[in-house]
Interface confidence: medium
Amino acid sequence: QTDPELTIMTRLGQVQGTRLPVPDRSHVIAFLGIPFAEPPLGKMRFKPPEPKKPWNDVFDARDYPSACYQYVDTSYPGFSGTEMWNPNRMMSEDCLYLNVWVPATPRPHNLTVMVWIYGGGFYSGSSSLDVYDGRYLAHSEKVVVVSMNYRVSAFGFLALNGSAEAPGNVGLLDQRLALQWVQDNIHFFGGNPKQVTIFGESAGAASVGMHLLSPDSRPKFTRAILQSGVPNGPWRTVSFDEARRRAIKLGRLVGCPDGNDTDLIDCLRSKQPQDLIDQEWLVLPFSGLFRFSFVPVIDGVVFPDTPEAMLNSGNFKDTQILLGVNQNEGSYFLIYGAPGFSKDNESLITREDFLQGVKMSVPHANEIGLEAVILQYTDWMDEDNPIKNREAMDDIVGDHNVVCPLQHFAKMYAQYSILQGQTGTASQGNLGWGNSGSASNSGNSQVSVYLYMFDHRASNLVWPEWMGVIHGYEIEFVFGLPLEKRLNYTLEEEKLSRRMMKYWANFARTGNPNINVDGSIDSRRRWPVFTSTEQKHVGLNTDSLKVHKGLKSQFCALWNRFLPRLLNVTENIDDAERQWKAEFHRWSSYMMHWKNQFDHYSKQERCTNL
């Protein structure tokens, strides 16, 4: 006899879930590892996902699925700070499954849905990590939480333009197919398909932003939350040419003969998954911090244009967004190769190491560009201070890759809410889940932007003090882990987590983090809307809510305005200089020859032969 509460009939067949305990002696119902796509095996490697075919038996959804094949970090074996991000289930290419957590209310109906997309640089990540456990959020806020696996690394993002066999972006299409599954099935679990908020962190947040941009993704969700990531910026996308170059390089590295695209893809499909993973880092054109081999590609389909161009033209979903950053976004990446940095010491950085580190952090910049970065981030009264050099490196990596791209994304989104308020053209019914319209073509825009800076360092953090509030370490507060007593958080941290879950869920329900499910507002101090002019944002920590203006505005002026222009103007200056030197050398030789001839001539008797 199956428990009716634990068995649900979906469009594709029955699934059986399990009860999971939550701290206040209650429980949630979890359905873990529901298939949403056919396994992308054999000929399906590198191809877009196909929807799962129906099944007849009751599908056992009581345990997490396999993780998608990915690089496993072995930098610090046995260290919980790195191991917490590594797959905690066996890896397989048969990994396209999703998880659903439902609060144990008598008859859940039309509950708000929150869909999590994990990060991991598009090369790693899995929905089964402890830090993504949806039970606490589902229980505390009475929302349905969903998370999915999607293909990463070459399996999700290898791209050869013009090839239907490896079109690129299939990892994003995995996510989109999971969102379609939510539209089709979540009402069976008591969720409201017209009230779906997608949220993610790092590459997961970049993915969320990509669905805001991608026209075919827009109708599949309502609102979006982006934690420490956006679709624009230096590491999130590559051109088709660069993607092709990397695919060909991967082929060479795993021993595929040079040939046409079909041969290359067939050969890559014949390789063991681990063979591809073992070589993936070697395809990068330069060694740099915060750079990843296989990432989304500007394909003209998923992305009609570059994220920057789409943002600048207002070509994005017209909806509310909540987004933010952590105080020390750069520190995690510094220990993976920046000279002088280690998790096992104070990482006091010499000036020489700092200058070398800047080069690694901005690998695409020329000498004059690097000089501009160094100028902005140096205290010239104290340039050899090793602590200041360490902190400057943290800021450079964090600002360049996370904070300033996110600030730009927020400003562009907010700017269009103002512009649309002024145009007065007809609305497209933008609050509806089915809105696929863009912000630039609706008069009474629904866009509103809420921005945060998370600056609380968890009391139980295993990473060294100097790393501060690290990239990724707000996630545990969003998912409510501090409510679990055995995890040794403080009472203040439990309160902060409850507050953040409330903000996130309020936003998912109403589009405004301040408004509770019953329409009330808890406190006088509100989280204000972020506008492109005032840039108001809140600090999220264990203290009272405090409002600030301008998110690292001076530094972001460098990354978002000055440096791109500088690099554009000086783009070919190195080549030009080399060419000029060569020409000058030739010209000097010629002039020397001419001078000798002239000297010789001038010594002659005048007109002797006339």
Partner: antibody
Framework: EVQLQQSGPELVKPGASVKISCKAS????????MNWVKQSPEKSLEWIGE????????TYNQNFKAKATLTVDQSSSTAYMQLKSLTSEDSAVYYC?????????????????WGTGTTVTVSS | DIQMTQSPASLSASVGATVTITCRTS??????LAWYQQRQGKSPQLLVY???NLADGVPSRFSGSGSGTQYSLKINSLQSEDVARYYC?????????FGGGTQLEIK
């Protein structure tokens, strides 16, 4: 009785640094933010920044970020402010001031207790 | 930064009179406003917070009012000990800023 006792007046040379102290008594030092305020005849009162004695978290007025460094010593319930690269423009009275308790329930960042004030004179 | 414009810069009134000091802000501060009194040679003291709430121990002849961008401090039945400089301060968004002050004298 809640009190904030500040260190005595300072006469310093241009280019030098100075560190002034503020000893708290009569309340839980780690339970409240500590702020610093500058008072000069030209610019009236200016907020320099604040620090949470319990977490060490600071917020600075950008105008003072390069000038002031805030620290605390929990064991002696004392807050410190170091001012560097002093010029005549830094000559002023500096106050420490307590603001709201560190709780997620109170939302007002006014200064309910002020220190006795420290006069800093920068002169060669 | 939010600008705080206090007026008048100085005023003189007789004992028993009623005086009003105003504070205009460059943007809406949602009543996140405090008033302070600073007597000659002393540290400032909190009078009013959240625009209208009287701090502990402050005589009831002091009252605060206002919203949005316009705020005022009213002193009824002026006493000789009220001779002081008065400042407004907002705490809406960092950095917190103060008004230029109003010097109150007794005629």
């Amino acid at each position: 009785e809640v009190q904030l006792q500040q260190s005595g007046p300072e006469l310093v040379k241009p280019g030098a640094s100075v560190k002034i102290s503020c000893k708290a008594s009569g309340y839980s030092f780690t339970g409240y933010y500590m702020n610093w305020v500058k008072q000069s005849p030209e610019k009236s009162l200016e907020w320099i920044g604040e620090m949470s004695p319990s977490t060490g978290r600071t917020t600075y007025n950008q105008n003072f970020k390069a000038k002031a460094t805030l620290t605390v010593d929990q064991s002696s319930s004392t807050a410190y402010m170091q001012l560097k690269s002093l010029t005549s423009e830094d000559s002023a009275v500096y106050y420490c001031a307590r603001s709201v308790p560190l709780t997620t329930l109170i939302e007002d960042w006014y200064f309910d207790v002020w220190g006795t004030g420290t006069t800093v004179t920068v002169s060669s | 930064d939010i600008q705080m414009t206090q007026s008048p810069a100085s005023l003189s009134a007789s004992v028993g009179a009623t005086v009003t000091i105003t504070c205009r802000t460059s943007e809406n501060i949602d009543s996140y406003l405090a008033w302070y009194q600073q007597r000659q040679g002393k540290s400032p003291q909190l009078l009013v917070y959240a625009a209208t709430n009287l701090a502990d121990g402050v005589p009831s002849r002091f009252s605060g009012s206002g919203s949005g961008t316009q705020y005022s401090l009213k002193i009824n039945s002026l006493q000789s000990e009220d001779v002081a400089r008065y400042y407004c301060q907002h705490y809406s968004t960092t950095p917190w800023t103060f008004g230029g002050g109003t010097q109150l004298e007794i005629k």
